[in-house]
Amino acid sequence: PRSIDVKYIGVKSAYVSYDVQKRTIYLNITNTLNITNNNYYSVEVENITAQVQFAKTVIGKARLNNITHIGPLDMKQIDYTVPTVIAEEMSYMYDFCTLISIKVHNIVLMMQVTVTTTYFGHSEQISQERYQYVDCGRNTTYQLGQSEYLNVLQPQQ
């Protein structure tokens, strides 16, 4: 069998809402993956599991099942959404994300994703992780790759 390539493209959109009383931020983050099947037979994308971390704390998880199949030598782009919650114990985040005098409220999040594919009863897992900028202050749609955090060092959070 040839490889199945998974490429995390980036954040596609982030939609923000707030709970004023709980000083909590809700971020629905939609990400884009490219999955390429380099084989001469179809493969199933059985599931995608994803989690989002801020400052080493997991703030959101998602799992998609029975997603799609990818034909021989084909590629599919898949969007998946991770609902995240930045809760009261990080209230300094609420202060920053709701600061109305500044326009962009970028925070650095670590996106982790694992894709499970199957073919002929065989299962394979491919994982990726990437730091991304996300604006926690307003609804934002990104051009693909626009939100990438380019610092190779782990950001100090």
Epitope: Y18, V20, D95, T98, L99, I100, S101, I102, K103
Partner: antibody, heavy 120, light 112 residues
Framework: DVQLQQSGAELVRPGASVKLSCTAS????????MYWVKQRPEQGLEWIGR????????ENAPKFRGMATMTADTSSNTAYLQLNSLTSEDTAVYYC?????????????WGHGTSVTVSS | DVLMTQTPLSLPVSLGDQASISCRSS???????????LEWYLQKPGQAPKLLID???NRFSGVPDRFSGSGSGTDFTLKISRVEAEDLGVYYC?????????FGSGTKLEIK
């Protein structure tokens, strides 16, 4: 190093117009709001309005609507304030200002101000 | 517009004294997101204003801890615990919760 460089002093006739500039260095204005503030001689501060340079969206104090127009040119990283139909009441120092922040640090930056004198 | 009323207009103090400046807004300046965007600026002669305090009580970076802000709703206070010569100038409160944002009329802190 973040700086807001404002254009030089202006002496203008009543009824004329003037366009003030504020050129930013050290940051890209499209990612930040730019604000304008007026201060008449020996008087207090008045908030004129703000502009989002990325899309040109503006919010003005009602008092300045029609007579103060804010624009921006992201290619030159410059914000502009055009003042129309000037009267002696518009003799003032005009400041541009912005606020730049990340999660850990927010800074407030002001230009040195442009003095506008309206006199015949 | 939200009217910001500052008192007193002039505040003569001796160095080392405590100074207190009041600011009252004509309506609540609690933003819909729950935050109160009340700020205090100091302007020295011939200079642009400098931000001292934002969101009622948060001291801005580099501002000495002798400055403190308090208040809620419509009534706010700036206190300087021990006035130093470098503190002299005009203090302005500012509300950034409701457009158009507005400044108070200013309080001149001067030596007795």
């Amino acid at each position: 190093d973040v700086q807001l460089q404002q254009s030089g002093a202006e002496l203008v006739r009543p009824g004329a117009s003037v366009k003030l500039s504020c050129t930013a260095s050290g940051f890209n204005i499209k990612d930040y709001y730019m604000y304008w503030v007026k201060q008449r001689p020996e008087q207090g501060l008045e908030w004129i309005g703000r502009i989002d340079p990325e899309d040109g969206d503006t919010e003005n104090a009602p008092k300045f609507r029609g007579m103060a127009t804010m624009t921006a040119d992201t290619s030159s990283n410059t914000a502009y304030l055009q003042l129309n139909s000037l009267t002696s009441e518009d003799t003032a120092v005009y400041y541009c200002t912005t606020r730049i922040g990340n999660l850990y640090h927010v800074m407030d930056y002001w230009g040195h101000g442009t003095s506008v004198t309206v006199s015949s | 517009d939200v009217l910001m009323t500052q008192t007193p207009l002039s505040l003569p103090v001796s160095l080392g004294d405590q100074a207190s400046i009041s600011c009252r807004s004509s309506q609540s300046i609690v933003h819909s997101n729950g935050n109160t965007y009340l700020e205090w600026y100091l302007q020295k002669p011939g200079q642009a204003p400098k931000l001292l305090i934002d969101k009622v009580f948060n001291r801005f970076s580099g501002v000495p801890d002798r400055f403190s802000g308090s208040g809620s709703g419509t009534d706010f206070t700036l206190k300087i615990s021990r006035v130093e010569a470098e503190d002299l100038g005009v203090y302005y409160c500012f509300q950034g919760s409701h457009v158009p944002f507005t400044f108070g009329s200013g309080t001149k802190l001067e030596i007795k």
